[in-house]
Interface confidence: low
């Protein structure tokens, strides 16, 4: 997260760290007791590595009573996700067992109504991604509030040049932005999960390259079918 600040500890009980061989790889969001939603591209280079999900965490390194690392029983990328596109960049991870719920671990309601969030709406994005362009990784969860950007502006030639489909949404990126390591994390508007941080190689903090988020409402049928 660029231009953000440390989150209040455990105030986002839905927040997950998707880990590869014990290290933070991507963000994720607990959407059901046994399911975490993340970005498909996160596991592209995972190969034979061990993928796990950390729940109930604020610090990645410090012991916390609510922290627990779960093995992954099944990883389900969206069937249409492809390595070279930002489209359909969703991944569902089934935990090895139902998460132990409590004040610091709780699923987040996700948007089912397929309607665009109004431009200018302030949404919260959180993650353990880099906090500066030197690549410094934080130990504690960071967050930032970002205004939603209308699709027409986001699709300008100088911005994302028509790449933002109706299944994607954008948020402003003027010095405050999601960044490397935040992919798969939640964009939360009004207490509801609206978007998932895409995991492309977009530069961060660049006003002319807004943040791109996959609209979960557009994938309600797929999410329901996997969770069923």
């Amino acid at each position: 997260i660029l231009g953000g600040r440390e989150a209040e500890a455990h105030a986002r009980p839905y927040m997950a760290s998707v880990q590869l061989n014990g290290a933070h790889l991507c963000g994720g969001v607990l959407v059901a007791e046994q399911w975490v939603l993340s970005a498909a591209h996160c596991l592209e280079d995972a190969a034979d590595g061990k993928v796990q999900v950390l729940l109930g965490a604020h610090s990645l390194s410090q012991p916390e009573p609510s922290k627990r690392l779960y093995d992954v029983l099944r990883a389900v990328p969206h069937p249409d996700s492809q390595p070279d596109t930002i489209d359909h960049d969703l991944l569902l991870l089934q935990l090895s067992e139902k998460a132990t719920l409590g004040p610091a671990v709780r699923p987040l309601p996700w948007q089912r109504v397929d309607r665009d969030v109004a431009p200018g709406t302030l949404c919260d994005v959180a993650g353990w991604g880099i906090v500066n362009h030197a690549g410094r990784r934080p130990d504690s969860l960071q967050h930032v509030l970002l205004p939603v950007l209308d699709r027409a502006t986001c699709n300008r030639r100088t911005h994302h040049d028509g790449a933002i489909t109706e299944r994607l949404m954008c948020a402003e990126s003027n010095r405050r932005d999601s960044c490397k390591g935040d992919s798969g994390g939640p964009l939360v508007c009004g207490g509801v999960l609206e978007g998932v941080v895409t995991s492309g190689s977009r530069v961060c903090g660049n006003r002319k390259k807004p943040g791109i988020y996959t609209r979960v409402a557009s994938y309600a049928a797929w999410i329901d079918s996997v969770l069923a």
């Epitope: 660029l2 362009h133 003027n174 961060c204 903090g205 660049n206 006003r207 002319k208």
Partner: antibody, heavy 125, light 107 residues
Framework: QVQVQESGPGLVKPSQTLSLTCTVS??????????WSWIRQPPGKGLEWMGD???????YYSPSLESRVTISRDTSKNQFSLQLSSVTAQDTAVYYC?????????????????WGQGTQVTVSS | SSALTQPSALSVSKGQTARITCQGN??????AHWYQQKTGQAPKLIVY???IRPSGIPERFSGSNSGGVATLTISGAQAEDEADYHC??????????FGGGTHLTVL
């Protein structure tokens, strides 16, 4: 120490294309956190941003000039160029090339830390 | 018209303080930068990110940006400070934009 130097014809006929080149020494035009820009100053007036080329080669143009301006680069020569088509007397100005420092990303319009001395271009028949 | 508005001219007595303003409704969101341009020369960066001086710029030059107005202050103006001063920031398209410039005369 970075140095930038403009070159090109000082006189261009109306309706023709103005072509200028900026040669950069002391630093690569492909370096991250910098873009390279063209700025002009009509006689007795203020500065006008025309466009930039980022370190990855992507270009950004002033909306008022977008239909007429093209900025390109030649990394092997460490040069970038400006072409302005269909010129009129209104395009008479001193043209500067400059380095655009970006604080946050490879392209983020920020401030201009190195400027060329400028080249006077007059549009006249 | 420019998205940034500067007075076209300003006079100050030698040794006095000159304040050059730059107004723009997006200045609360963006940094302001200032350039000095002497007759027949290229602009030179003298203040960036509202209030930071590049190395080699005298301490008498300072800047601020508050409430939609950026101000360049020259404390104890010298004869060699007579020049045009340009503010620069970003406009509503997030493109670089300059003010119209202010000519400072040192009396």
């Amino acid at each position: 120490q970075v140095q930038v130097q403009e070159s090109g014809p000082g006189l261009v006929k109306p309706s023709q294309t103005l072509s200028l080149t900026c040669t950069v020494s002391g630093g690569s035009i492909s370096t991250s956190y910098y873009a390279w820009s063209w700025i002009r100053q009509p006689p007795g007036k203020g500065l006008e941003w025309m466009g930039d080329i980022a370190n990855d080669g992507s270009t950004y143009y002033s909306p008022s000039l977008e239909s007429r301006v093209t900025i390109s680069r030649d990394t092997s020569k460490n040069q970038f160029s400006l072409q302005l088509s269909s010129v009129t007397a209104q395009d008479t100005a001193v043209y500067y090339c400059a380095r655009l420092r970006s604080l946050y990303t490879d392209y983020d319009p920020h401030y201009y830390d190195y400027w060329g001395q400028g080249t006077q271009v007059t549009v006249s028949s | 018209s420019s998205a940034l508005t500067q007075p076209s001219a300003l006079s100050v007595s030698k040794g006095q303080t000159a304040r050059i303003t730059c107004q723009g409704n997006l200045l609360p969101r963006h940094y302001a930068h200032w350039y000095q341009q002497k007759t027949g020369q290229a602009p030179k960066l003298i203040v960036y990110d509202d209030n930071i001086r590049p190395s080699g710029i005298p301490e008498r030059f300072s800047g601020s940006n508050s409430g939609g107005v950026a101000t360049l202050t020259i404390s104890g103006a010298q004869a060699e400070d007579e020049a045009d001063y340009h503010c620069q920031s970003a406009d509503s398209n997030d493109d670089a934009v300059f003010g119209g410039g202010t000519h400072l005369t040192v009396l």
